[in-house]
């Protein structure tokens, strides 16, 4: 949502956050702003302090409950407000009618792990973390590895396109130190996008036998 | 029905203090703000700053920084606005008025009937 | 500090005619979340001031729809389409877009 010069984005993580971001141009005085959350169904309202992220931008974290209580359904709308200190009052500087299973970012996988790895080939499994069981299988997964002197962003992506919790990485170096991360996306939500990437997990193909093709 | 009912006219000396009252009803007083305007004698209207009942917080106009106090007691919804070392300038007919603590709308929207205070030698 | 300039300082009508009251402020008073909080208010003789018109153009509730306001950036106008005795008593402009608000200096409205 946009009012004035100012972007209000919002993700909810299909469980128990709402995660914020406000830009403003022209950057305000030393001044405390929130964002509100407001349910149209719920008895419950919540608040967080916006904080800086950068010169014109600032972000926090709407914690709605426990991290794994399902906290809205497909069919709550939030009003989400920005509102900033001015005197003694609060003015409105953002809002926004927040359909929550329509901006989904779930949170990065965790727990990666080599089950196995060889001289080509290194199995990775991974969990999902505070993801609704309202999904049921209708996630998918995003993958890249990084191989030594190249970048993230020169990584090839590869797309699980269904609940699948594990990759099977093929054409590896022998005795190589490679790097994994993967991120996840529900396939539901006009406005859903993917989760942060998971922490780099770390592994080292197994060097060739000597006198022997693996 | 939401009222504002302000404290009886006061005649000051120049140097001196006055305190004017503002008792609210109507309406939960620690739920807006409480803005404070003057008008001095023929002339336009001044805000002052204003109080917010809930926390007491308060912002006062640079104007009068230094001399103006807004103050609330709860228990009776009622909020006080002191200005000390009155000087002739200072008299006026002072509001009190009502205002929503998130300022969406509007800054004002209701009025207690002013008090008149005169500061003479 | 925002000044605000009105004029005319008096304007005397003829009931049942219009009245036209112009208000400039001395800079932008768009707030920077879009809105414009300029307010007009009512003080009949003896009287409070009355809250008329909220953000440029809304009028508060109980406000007969004789009173419009328009207006933006930093030239704004309150009208009354139809002039009647209950009208007569002196107008303020008000912005609450930056700190401190400030008031217009008033326009008196009398009958002719």
């Known amino acids: 949502a946009v009012n004035g010069t100012s972007q209000f984005t919002c993700f909810y993580n299909s469980r128990a956050n709402i995660s914020c971001v406000w830009s403003q141009d022209g950057a305000l005085q030393d001044t405390s702003c929130q964002v509100h959350a407001w349910p149209d169904r719920r008895r419950w309202n919540q608040t967080c302090e916006l904080l800086p992220v950068s010169q014109a931008s600032w972000a926090c974290n709407l914690i709605l409950g426990a991290p794994d209580s399902q906290k809205l359904t497909t069919v709550d709308i939030v009003t989400l407000r920005v509102l900033c200190r001015e005197g003694v009052r609060w003015r409105v500087m953002a809002i926004q009618d927040f359909k929550p299973f329509e901006n989904l970012r779930l949170m990065a996988p965790i727990s990666l792990q080599v089950v196995h790895v060889e001289t080509h080939r290194c199995n990775i499994s991974w969990e999902i973390s505070q993801a609704s069981h309202y999904f049921e299988r209708h996630l998918e997964f995003e993958a890249r590895t990084l191989s030594p002197g190249h970048t993230w962003e020169e990584a090839p992506l590869l797309t699980l396109k269904q609940k699948q919790e594990w990759i099977c990485l093929e054409t590896l170096t022998p005795d190589t130190q490679y790097e994994f991360q993967v991120r996840v996306k529900p396939l539901q939500g006009e406005f859903t996008t993917w989760s942060p990437w998971s922490q780099p997990l770390a592994f080292r193909t197994k060097p060739a036998a000597l006198g022997k093709d693996t | 029905e939401v009222q504002l009912v302000q404290s009886g006219a006061e005649v000051k000396k120049p140097g001196a203090s006055v305190k004017v009252s503002c008792k609210a009803s109507?309406?939960?007083?620690?739920?807006?703000?409480i803005s404070w305007v003057r008008q001095a004698t023929g002339q336009g209207l001044e805000w002052m700053g204003e109080?917010?009942?809930?926390?007491?917080?308060?912002y006062y106009n640079e104007m009068f920084k230094g001399r103006v106090t807004m103050t609330r007691d709860t228990s009776i919804s009622t909020a006080y606005m002191e200005l000390s070392s009155l000087r002739s300038e200072d008299t006026a007919v002072y509001y009190c008025?009502?205002?929503?603590?998130?300022?969406?709308?509007?800054?004002?929207?209701?009025w207690g009937q002013g008090t008149t205070v005169t500061v003479s030698s | 500090d925002v000044v605000m300039t009105q004029t005319p300082l008096s304007l005397p009508v003829t009931l049942g005619q219009p009245a036209s009251i112009s208000c400039r402020s001395s800079q932008n008073i768009v707030h920077s979340n879009g809105n414009t909080y300029l307010e007009w208010y009512q003080q009949r003789p003896g009287q409070s001031p009355r809250l008329l018109i909220y953000?440029?153009?809304n009028r508060f509730s109980g406000v007969p729809d004789r009173f419009s306001g328009s207006g933006s950036g930093t030239d704004f106008t309150l009208k009354i389409s139809r002039v009647e005795a209950e009208d007569v008593g002196v107008y303020y402009c008000?912005?609450?877009?930056?700190?401190?608000?400030?008031f217009g200096g008033g326009t008196k409205v009398e009958i002719k």
């Open positions: 109507g309406y939960t007083f620690t739920d807006y703000v």
């Open positions: 953000k440029v153009s």
């Open positions: 008000f912005q609450g877009s930056h700190i401190p608000w400030t």
């Open positions: 109080i917010y009942p809930g926390d007491g917080n308060t």
């Open positions: 008025a009502r205002g929503s603590y998130t300022y969406d709308n509007y800054a004002m929207d209701f």
